[in-house]
């Protein structure tokens, strides 16, 4: 069956970028890096200059959701993290500008951002039981939990 958000008419309006140029490290202290033009992966780095820097933009839901809804963009590019299905790699989608409004099938661009102490979780709005995750010898993907790693540390001001 279709994900619940595709069945609803919830509209998400862009508010503002709330973080620029941060790095995501998973629970094994691996940083997210570019695997190729389309995919991301995770690796233990000595030099964080190789890590992907992300910008995070906040969106407001028309249904006044208490969750923080965000879009993730690779800094200084027009590439946005896009969810696919469970165990499928997230894609990098090129768009000329950040979307003013997101609804329907485009919610695969959005994630619910939750924090628990220093742990950060990104749940797909299109697939609300799945998280952005790292997996050994695989691309960054959507996963429901172990053995994939779904919690991340945000490292800011690395410039």
């Amino acid at each position: 069956s279709a994900p619940f958000s595709f069945l609803s008419n919830v509209k998400y309006n862009f508010m503002r970028i709330i973080k620029y140029e941060f790095i995501l490290n998973d629970a094994l202290n691996q940083s997210i890096i570019r695997a190729n033009d389309q995919y991301l992966t995770a690796a233990a780095l000595h030099n964080l200059d190789e890590a992907v820097k992300f910008d995070m933009g906040a969106y407001k839901s028309s249904k006044d959701d208490a969750k923080i809804t965000v879009i993730l963009r690779i800094s200084k590019t027009q590439l946005y993290v896009t969810a696919q299905d469970e165990d499928q790699p997230v894609l990098l989608k090129e768009m000329p500008e950040i979307p003013k409004t997101i609804t329907g099938s485009e919610t695969n661009l959005l994630f619910f951002w939750e924090t628990h102490g220093t742990k950060n979780y990104f749940t797909s709005v299109a697939h609300p039981n799945l998280f952005i995750a790292t997996k050994q010898d695989y691309w960054v993907c959507l996963a429901g939990g172990p053995p994939s790693i779904t919690d991340f540390q945000i490292l800011e001001n690395q410039a």
Partner: nanobody, 122 residues
Framework: EVQLLESGGGLVQPGGSLRLSCAAS????????MAWVRQAPGKGLEWVSS????????YYADSVKGRFTISRDNSKNTLYLQMNSLRAEDTAVYYC???????????????WGQGTLVTVSS
């Protein structure tokens, strides 16, 4: 009513310096992230630099990093941009503004005032 009045622009030779000022009124200046944006002749708006309300953190576009310095004096409700080692490609109208919602999406820019023209030419 929000008012931002930029000044300090002018004609300068390549390698020269200028200091821009922006006098703010009509809002609580010391609560806002402030920014400088610019528009080169025939081009779109470009974010240049931002500064947090206290002035503790500053941010710069790659094109001006190491040459420009943003600062503020909250007691005077004034924003500054010190521009050194100026280049021909810095020629633009410079506006001060509240930090745009997205530094890299021009539709989110919201600026006021007439701006101040900086021309870098020999």
């Amino acid at each position: 009513e929000v008012q931002l009045l930029e000044s300090g622009g002018g004609l300068v030779q390549p390698g020269g310096s200028l200091r821009l000022s922006c006098a703010a009124s009509g809002f609580t200046f010391d609560r806002y992230i402030m920014a400088w944006v610019r528009q080169a002749p025939g081009k779109g708006l470009e974010w240049v630099s931002s500064i947090t309300p206290s002035g503790a953190a500053t941010y710069y576009a790659d094109s001006v990093k190491g040459r420009f310095t943003i600062s503020r004096d909250n007691s005077k409700n004034t924003l500054y941009l010190q521009m050194n080692s100026l280049r021909a490609e810095d020629t633009a109208v410079y506006y001060c503004a509240e930090e745009p919602a997205d530094r890299y999406s021009t539709w989110t820019f919201d600026y006021w005032g007439q701006g101040t023209l900086v021309t870098v030419s020999s």
